[in-house]
């Protein structure tokens, strides 16, 4: 056969679906690789062909679209399973071609089993809710296109294994789950089970997401430098090791880049000749506020180093702050005999 533009195995799109549930999988060519959509391709006389390689096999084979009850079907650029089976796991390829053009991409599909509490190897999306922020909602994800708008599905929400039946704080409202107040105790996995009829059969879609309650923007502050501060003086003799921690607290801010850096005499440590090392550690609170510590270390400090300006800088979306460390050279204690002699007025 003639040459085909092969985009290879698109492992970025590791698709996971639950066993015994419907799955609709769009050909990734039109989503990520080609500059035109399926309708344009179809109008131009291009045909979309599907095939697959079973798990732990090398042989590409056509997909059987003649299974009972049309269990696997294709509709436009979507491959449908109604429902999936465990042995549907494998690498699927969609190929767009005519006599003069060919382009294809493969992607892995994993059919996953779940237990009665919805635990599974499925990678879960994380939805962040602001703590104590008023009404917030999560929405049952990835259910578009499974049933027409004329069909009214029933939706049941669970937290972990427990069906959410009351509406005291977390209110199930169809595809949405509303939180009157988000609390640390609301952290966990939430599952929506969408049940809908189709051609005399009943299908279930199970979608689980992780809720993480994070710091609220109304409580967010600019970075706070806890160290260095005015109360600690780094007093060293030449030849000793100088260690100065820069400890900064950052409020959680969605999509904020938190930065901490040192300057020595106004320059970045990389831009000066001193033998300086910087080690960073990061810790998080339960609401994802962040504490970053950068320890500036000079193994054998010189008297010149002790005259320099050491400034810790921090920046987030809320602002930028800086604080200089108080560094000074230790005054050597006078020798005992000299001090004694002077004390007795010796000349």
């Amino acid at each position: 056969s003639e040459r085909c533009d092969d985009w290879g195995l698109d492992t970025m799109r590791q698709i996971q679906v639950f066993e015994d549930e419907p799955a609709r999988i769009k050909c990734p060519l039109f989503e990520h690789f080609l500059k035109f959509n399926y309708s344009t391709a179809h109008s131009a006389g291009l045909t979309l062909i599907w095939y697959w390689t079973r798990q732990d096999r090398d042989l590409e084979e056509p997909i059987n679209f003649r299974l009972p009850e049309n269990r696997i079907s294709k509709e436009k650029d979507v491959l449908w399973f109604r429902p999936t089976l465990l042995n549907d796991t494998g690498n699927y390829t969609c190929m767009l071609r005519n006599t003069t053009y060919c382009s294809k991409v493969a992607f892995p599909l994993e059919v996953v089993q779940k237990d009665s509490c919805f635990n599974s190897p499925m990678k879960l999306p994380v939805h962040k809710l602001y703590i104590e922020y008023g009404i917030q909602r999560i929405t049952c994800p990835n259910v578009d296109g499974y049933f027409p708008s004329s069909v009214k599905p029933t939706i049941t929400w669970y937290m972990g294994c427990y069906k959410i039946q009351n509406f005291n704080n977390v209110i199930p409202e169809g595809m949405n789950l509303s939180f009157l107040i988000a609390l640390i105790s609301n952290n966990g996995n939430y599952t929506c089970v969408v049940t809908y009829p189709e051609n005399g059969r009943t299908f279930h879609l199970t979608r689980t997401l992780t809720v993480k309650v994070v710091g609220s923007p109304k409580n967010a502050v600019p970075p706070v430098i806890h160290s260095p501060n005015d109360h600690v003086v780094y007093e060293k003799e030449p030849g000793e090791e100088l260690l100065i921690p820069c400890t900064v607290y950052f409020s959680f801010l969605m999509d904020s880049r938190n930065e901490v850096w040192w300057t020595i005499d106004g320059k970045k440590p990389d831009d000066i000749t001193i033998d300086v090392t910087i080690n960073e550690s990061i810790s998080h609170s339960r609401t994802e506020d962040e504490t970053r510590t950068q320890i500036l270390s000079i193994k054998k400090v010189t008297s010149e180093d002790l005259k320099r300006s050491y400034v810790c800088h921090a920046r987030s979306a809320k602002g930028e702050v800086a604080k200089a460390a108080k560094v000074k050279q230790k005054v050597p204690a006078p020798r005992y005999t000299v001090e004694l002699a002077c004390g007795f007025g010796a000349t």
Epitope: I164, Q165, I171, L180
Partner: antibody
């Protein structure tokens, strides 16, 4: 477990039109500590139940009110004392009612209003 | 705004009989509905929440059904102690508010 209501004073909650009154509700015997919403509901003589609003009893400051309240009523709470209060201002004869507090635990273990106070009668009259 | 409409009122039935009370929401409240029983001089008592879940300690002759906008409370094997007024409570939210709205109440008379 109980919700004990107080307020209205020795006169049994008789207030002049335009006046103010504070009603309070003390929670005791809860294993749930302060993880619940305290709701306030009123009932005019011979009439049905009407929701006023709710306040979260824990450390987070969160309140919701019925739209008709229009800022005349204010909910507050004292976390340490496990007390929730309803401040009634600019009272009119139409506010004459029994005022109830009710609990809704902020988890999935029970229903809204599984526990109620005994009610306090507020009479607005000149 | 959410409106809860209860019918009929009053309703009467003989001991051992069955009573059905309906509650209609002006908008979809899914299963966010509770039923309360109130006797004269007493605070309301929770019977059912989540449209159909029986509250702790409530006899099984009380049952709730429905979702969306139409809900029903059924009392079967009616007892004289069931004479009371019954209220439904619907709950929904919007962007920044929560609405807790009671129905007008249905008086049950036991003959």
């Amino acid at each position: 477990q109980q919700l004990e209501q107080s307020g209205g004073g020795a006169e049994g909650g008789l207030v002049k039109p335009g006046g103010s009154l504070e009603l309070c509700c003390k929670a005791s015997g809860f294993s749930q500590s302060n993880n619940y919403w305290m709701h306030w509901v009123r009932q005019a003589p011979g009439k049905g139940l009407e929701w006023i609003g709710c306040i979260y009893a824990g450390s987070s400051d969160s309140t919701y009110y019925a739209s008709w309240v229009n800022g005349r009523f204010t909910l507050s709470r004292d976390i340490d004392q496990s007390i929730g209060c309803l401040q009634l201002n600019s009272l009119t004869a139409a506010d004459t009612a029994i005022y109830y507090c009710a609990r809704a635990i902020a988890d999935f273990s029970s229903g809204w209003g599984d526990l109620w106070g005994q009610g306090t009668l507020v009479t607005v009259s000149s | 705004a959410l409106v809860m409409t209860q019918t009929p009122s009053p309703v009467s039935a003989a001991v051992g009989g069955t009573v059905t009370i309906n509650c209609q929401a002006s908008e979809d409240i899914y299963s966010n509905l509770a039923w309360f029983q109130q006797k004269p001089g007493q605070p309301p008592k929770l019977l059912i929440y989540g449209a159909s879940t029986l509250a702790s300690g409530v006899p099984s002759r009380f049952s709730g059904s429905g979702s969306g906008t139409e809900f029903t409370l059924t009392i079967s094997g009616l007892q004289s102690d069931d004479a009371a007024t019954y209220y439904c409570l619907g709950v929904c939210t919007d962007i920044s508010a929560v609405y807790n709205v009671f129905g007008g109440g249905t008086e049950v008379v036991v003959k």
